[in-house]
Each structure stands twice: as C-alpha cells, then as structure tokens.
C-alpha cells in the first residue's frame, strides 16, 4: 500500500525518495510518474535523470534536493486538487531486474483561509536536515546482489520518521505543507 | 520517420544459437527502452525480453526477461549503433517465432509504440 | 502472471454495424496500462489504443476503449472493410506484459 502525503492547495508538495549512489557522481538513471508503477519505467513520466543529470522534467515539477547524492526527492510547485494520485519514483538500478519502485499517493487539501505562517516558516527551517538524514527513523536497506556497491536506503517513507512525533499531528492538524528550500 | 529493421533470423537446430538484431533510425536510440516480441505461426503474441533506454552507457541498463527464456536470451543495445539485440541460445522448437523489436515511448504514450517488421526464426532439425 | 482473455476469437461483421471485443484479466489491471494493438496478415502490429480509450495516431474516430479492473473493450461504432484484422489486448500493469490471444475480425 502506498505512503500517504499532504499538501494545501496552493502550496508546493513533496515526495521523498532516495537512494545512496555506489560513489559520488555514479548516478542511477530515476523517473518520476504520475500514476501507480508499471513494469518498466514510470507512466506519464514528469521528470527523468540520467547517469549525470536531470535530461527531462515538465513545469511545477523539479528536484530540490541533491540528487547527484542520490535525493532524487519530487518537488511538486504550486499545487492544485488535480495534483491528488498516486506517483511513482523508480530508481532504474542496472542489472536483471534491479529496479526499484515506490508508490506515493498525494492527496491535496483545499487551501485553509488563515494559514499560520509562522509555524510554517518554523517547520521549514526544521525539517531538512531531518529530510535528508539516511539514519532517522525506520529504514530498510536492500544490498542488490548483482550491483553489490549499491546500497538502495528506502527512506521513501516521510511519513514514517513523522507519524510517532507530536509535530507530525501538529502538521498533520494545520495543514501545513513541508516546503524545501 | 521512425524506423525499426530486424535481421538475423533463419533456421536453427535445437540447441543450437542465434543473435537477431535490430537497427532503429528517426528518433534518439538511447533515449527509449526497447523490447523484444515474439508471435508463432498463426498464434498471439508474445512480449520476451526489454531493457531500459536513459542511460549514458548501454551498461547500465535495466533488463527483464519473460520467464520462458531466462537464462537462454539475452538482450542488449549499442547505442552508438542505435542497434538492439537478442543473443538467443539452446534453441527449442517452441520458439519458433516470429520476432519483433518495439520502441518503449516514455514521453508521449509510453508503451509498445513502433515497431519492425519481424525477423522469422524456425527451430527445427 | 495476469492472464487477458480476449473474446470472441474470431468474429464477422457486416459493414456499418456496431462492433465490441473485449478483454477479461484475471486479475485487475490499471487503466493506463491497457493497450490494444491492430495486426493485418503480413504485418506488424500497430498500436491502436493506449491508455483503455485513448486512440493512437492516425485511428479513425469509430474506434473507442473502455473499461476498468478486469473488464475492457473496444469498440467500432460503424464496421468498414479496413478494420478487419486482428486485434489485441496488452497489460503492462504487472511483471510479465501479457497479450490477450486476439480477436480476429472479419468483414461479411
């Protein structure tokens, strides 16, 4: 079942996911896919990157985070109800199918009429390390036998390090959106 | 114009080994994945092998194989050629086919969007 | 593996009348993954339809796709001669990509 994310219309969502490159610049080909995985690549393909850098993406939708280190996390502009589905990100690991894929459904709240904008400048300022910090929270590792030097971290799961911790209700309640950058 | 020509199809012994190939033009090879089809005589048809497009170097690919031929086919790409190949080996009569390369469209229908003309193997003693 | 049964094998039709062939999965398959593909004798397939209902380039307009979950068809709102062929269905919802076994469609 997929992991649920929220965002206020509006605001820009997130979709995290991750992986560690084998070394520094040795970079996996990931696309990103409005709609649940198929069997190759992503359908409806809305941002793709190559061994060396992000060769195709369409508006609203750009990674914020440094992919060249394997946060290859979706940053969804400006959102609106439409927005709402479920995504995929697949991280296309080389080999007899190595690849990766991960659902991520986002769901879009219609805008709240006063949004509370300094906790929401708190929450930004906040969560980014936490973001992007392989160690936080629950993780699992998948060592791939026929690429033994990649190690795949799935830290797709946001909701994960946030669902036990009082500020996950509290965003969760506000309505806020975590907003990178 | 988008084109996808097969060749290196023929008769064969069974166990015996074959290596088809597929030469696209009009359009970016390394861009696409590319899957191998297969119909036999008078039947339906028969998806056997993709490896993904996207990469830099035609090693790092992604592969899947249809479980009939794991093992036996193996499929790969030159993308400075812009060509596709099946290295087919122990040869059985049941793949005795008619083989098809077809492009993966990512960008627009992302599916099965062209493809050749077919290359005919028969495997037969 | 999903397994896509098409029906009926094989069938006629007398031009101007309304055609459906269907496609049955054994197990649900998503809508943007249900392809169908035209094959004439001595040709490659064509794609036809993408997406349940979305014709590929160049389809005439009396072509349409539907459905969800296990149950998809096409169909042609007035048969013409051109459209005799072969017909097949295609998920690629799930590992491995499957065909149906085909329709072929015949002119009276």
């Known amino acids: 079942s997929e992991v649920e994310y929220r965002a206020e219309v509006g605001q820009n969502a997130y979709l995290p996911c991750f992986y560690t490159p084998a070394a520094p610049g040795n970079l996996v080909p990931v696309c990103w896919g409005k709609g649940a995985c198929p069997v190759f690549e992503c359908g409806n393909v809305v941002l793709r990157t190559d061994e060396r850098d992000v060769n195709y993406w369409t508006s609203r939708y750009w990674l914020n985070g440094d992919f060249r280190k394997g946060d290859v996390s979706l940053t969804i502009e400006n959102v609106t109800l439409a927005d709402s589905g479920i995504y995929c990100c697949r991280i296309q690991i080389p080999g007899i199918m190595n690849d990766e894929k991960f659902n991520l459904k986002l769901v879009i709240k219609p805008a709240k009429v006063t949004p509370a904008p300094t906790r929401q400048r708190d929450f930004t300022a906040a969560f980014p390390r936490m973001l992007t910090t392989r160690g936080h929270g629950p993780a699992e590792t998948q060592t791939l036998g026929s690429l033994p030097d990649i190690n795949l971290t799935q830290i797709s799961t946001l909701a994960n390090e946030l669902r036990d911790s009082r500020l996950a209700n509290d965003l969760r309640d506000s309505g806020a959106t975590i907003r990178i950058g | 114009e988008v084109q996808l020509v097969e060749s290196g199809g023929g008769l064969v012994r069974p166990g015996g080994s074959l290596k088809l190939s597929c030469v696209v033009s009009?359009?970016?090879?390394?861009?696409?994945?590319m899957h191998w089809v297969r119909q036999a005589p008078e039947k339906g048809l028969d998806w056997i092998a993709y490896i993904s497009g996207g990469s830099i170097s035609s090693g790092s690919s992604t592969i899947y194989y249809a479980d009939t031929v794991k093992g036996r086919f193996t499929i790969s790409r030159d993308n400075a050629k812009n060509t596709l190949f099946l290295q087919m080996t122990s040869l059985r009569s049941e793949d005795t086919a008619m083989y098809y390369c077809?492009?993966?469209?990512?960008?627009?229908?992302?599916?099965?969007?062209?493809w050749g003309q077919g290359t005919s193997v028969t495997v037969s003693s | 593996q999903i397994v896509l049964t098409q029906s009926p094998a094989i069938m006629s039709a007398s031009p101007g009348k309304k055609v459906t062939l269907t496609c049955s999965a054994s197990s649900s398959v998503s809508s943007s993954y249900l392809y169908w593909y035209q094959q004439k004798p001595g040709s490659s397939p064509k794609l036809w339809i993408y997406?349940?209902?979305n014709l590929a380039s160049g389809v005439p307009a009396r072509f349409s796709g539907s459905g969800s979950g296990t149950s998809y068809s096409l169909t042609i709102s007035s048969m013409e001669a051109e459209d005799a062929a072969s017909y097949f269905c295609?998920?690629?919802?799930?590992?491995?990509?499957?065909f149906g076994g085909g329709t072929k469609l015949e002119i009276k």
């Open positions: 997406s349940t209902s």
């Open positions: 009009g359009f970016t090879f390394s861009d696409y994945g």
């Open positions: 295609l998920q690629w919802s799930s590992y491995p990509p499957t």
């Open positions: 077809a492009r993966h469209d990512w960008r627009g229908l992302y599916a099965m969007d062209y």
